[in-house]
């Protein structure tokens, strides 16, 4: 009778992560008597996957009933496959011996490759806010996928971006891979409602890409424009001066009124109105008692927005002349609080 051969018919098997891998193995003879063991790898570092004779292998089930005397099918199923299971599996026949069984024949091996889905892309923006016209970087990361081939695209409000750089690691073969991409985005004043999207396509996703998003509202700072206006006289000795703070984002804003350089009142923006583009407007007013002043009064509206250096706008209130509506429609310059724009 011809000597027993161990046949592993599949040179390679490709399985999706989470699924069950079937590793086929048959023997050509019932003789010699002895168990089958499955190993990953060979040599001194090989890993025992299944032992027909003894042991507990919760992820492994046999395809046929190995207790039947005439059984020659030693195929196994390994459940809940992960990328870490990739490798070459050997079906090894042992000959019954005393005290120990002796290795008798090995199959040629089956390469198990694992297809694993990428994790949901995580998009992160810069640590600090930036103002319009500045270029900011966004990163996108996804992990744990296999095989290595993957496609990543960037979008801003549905428009595909072209200025980005992508790396897949590691460079060589691995059980699973990670992708890291950095995109550059130029901010505009209209970007409060904008979104940046990172889209990842992989063979395991069956044409339904994964997306990660970042809202530019968390990245952008739109500095305010200031306008100080003197309103008509309410009473003979009172003047109402307003400071219009327009088109700012985010809402965090503190306004200080100064009369001739001395702090008159400080308040925090609360009841703001929202513009269509997501920016905010706010107005503060100051009632000035003209009779309390002998000389002309210099009123300054000083605004500190989102922790940035203060910007200010000044208005000269003529005490000698009869107060009439006056002011400026010129936008305030972004000057430090120690410099004043006098109109």
């Amino acid at each position: 009778e011809e000597e027993l051969q161990v046949i592993q018919p599949d040179k390679s098997v490709l399985v999706a992560a989470g699924e069950t891998a079937t590793l086929r193995c048959t023997a050509t003879s019932l003789i010699p008597v002895g168990p089958i063991q499955w190993f990953r790898g060979a040599g001194p570092g090989r890993e025992l996957i299944y032992n027909q004779k003894e042991g507990h292998f919760p992820r492994v089930t046999t395809v046929s009933d190995l207790t039947k005397r005439n059984n020659m099918d030693f195929s196994i199923r390994i459940g809940n496959i992960t990328p870490a299971d990739a490798g070459t599996y050997y079906c090894v026949k042992f000959r019954k011996g005393s005290p120990d069984d002796v290795e008798f024949k090995s199959g040629a091996g089956t390469e198990l490759s694992v297809r694993a889905k990428p994790s949901a892309p995580v998009v992160s923006g810069p640590a600090a806010r930036a103002t319009p016209q500045h270029t900011v970087s966004f990163t996108c990361e996804s992990h744990g996928f296999s095989p290595r081939d993957i496609t990543l695209k960037w979008f801003k409000n549905g428009n595909e971006l072209s200025d980005f750089q992508t790396n897949v690691d590691p460079v060589g073969e691995s059980v699973s891979y990670s992708i890291h991409s950095t995109a550059k985005v130029v901010l505009t004043r209209e970007d409060v409602h904008s979104q940046v999207i990172c889209e990842v396509a992989h063979v395991t996703l069956q044409g339904d890409p994964l997306r990660g998003t970042a809202n530019l509202s968390e990245t952008i700072r739109v500095p305010p424009t200031l306008e100080v206006t003197q309103q008509p006289v309410r009473a003979e000795n009172q003047v109402n001066v307003t400071c219009q703070v327009r088109k700012f984002y985010p809402q965090r804003l503190q306004l200080t009124w100064l009369e001739n350089g001395n702090v008159s009142r400080t308040e925090t923006a609360s009841t703001v109105t929202e513009n269509k583009d997501g920016t905010y407007n706010w107005m503060s007013w100051l009632l000035v008692n003209v009779s309390a002043h002998r000389d002309d009064v210099k009123l300054t509206c000083q605004v500190e927005h989102d922790g940035q250096p203060a910007v200010s706008k000044s208005h000269d209130l003529k005490v000698s002349a009869h107060p009439k509506e006056q002011g400026s429609n010129t936008a305030a310059e972004n000057t430090g609080s120690n410099e004043r724009n006098i109109y």
């Epitope: 060979a42 570092g45 290795e103 008798f104 024949k105 590691p170």
Partner: antibody, heavy 123, light 107 residues
């Protein structure tokens, strides 16, 4: 097809250093481990080291610890063997040989071999 | 270290002969044995692994057998291109060791 191409022959003096290379092609370098094997003229084969090309970690035979350094340049799919402070008994052909396993955790038999690099040490 | 002994340093053969090359391990190595063929000026070529598995592309006149400590490589129908050195190797335990080789010559 799978190829391991080694650098050319070297003639060195005792005490010098030699560095030879083995460039792999036809497969993904870091999927399979790499060994180095020594063969002195007219003699048998002696296994020196196995390198896990994915992690870069080597496993040495006792006789080849110390003066022998093994390294990888994965981006160039190349393995290197450096011998310091050369001795006459280092005169041999050095072969690189590839593992059979896909993600093997250890070496076993040597499925593919480089053509060999003859290192001659002579005063 | 495990010593792999190839007792025949040289073997004289005739074309068409059945040639049996033996290798004995100093301790049990299971079936963790490979056989290589090496021709002058060339690198070794893998013939057999796991004691009896023929490597891809190896002619079926080459057969490996044995387990435990005693192993054989059989060439069933000796050809002129088979004139070479033959080495066994164990990979059961570090360090991996080779036999000293058996050289086939024509009578």
């Amino acid at each position: 097809q799978i190829q391991l191409v080694q650098s050319g022959p070297e003639l060195k003096k005792p005490g010098e250093t030699v560095k030879i290379s083995c460039k792999a092609s036809g497969y993904t370098f870091t999927t399979y481990g790499m060994s180095w094997v020594k063969q002195a003229p007219g003699k048998g084969l002696k296994w020196m080291v196995w390198i896990n090309t994915y992690s870069g970690v080597p496993t040495y035979a006792d006789d080849f610890q110390g003066r022998f350094a093994f390294s990888l340049e994965t981006s160039a799919s190349t393995s290197y063997l450096q011998i310091n402070n050369l001795r006459n008994e280092d005169t041999a052909t050095y072969f690189c040989a590839r593992d059979p396993h896909y993600y093997g955790t250890s070496p076993a038999w040597f499925a593919y071999w480089g053509q060999g690099t003859l290192v001659t040490v002579s005063a | 270290d495990i010593v792999m002994t190839q007792s025949q340093k040289f073997m004289s053969t005739t074309i068409g002969d059945r040639v049996i090359i033996t290798c004995k391990a100093s301790q049990i190595v299971g079936i963790a044995v490979a056989w290589y063929q090496q021709k002058p000026g060339q690198s070794p070529k893998l013939l057999i692994y796991s004691a009896s598995n023929r490597f891809t592309g190896v002619p079926d006149r080459f057969t490996g057998s044995g387990s435990g400590t005693d192993f054989t490589l059989t060439i069933s129908n000796m050809q002129s291109e088979d004139l070479a050195d033959y080495f066994c190797q164990q990979y059961s335990t570090y360090p991996f060791t080779f036999g000293s080789g058996t050289k086939l010559e024509i009578k």
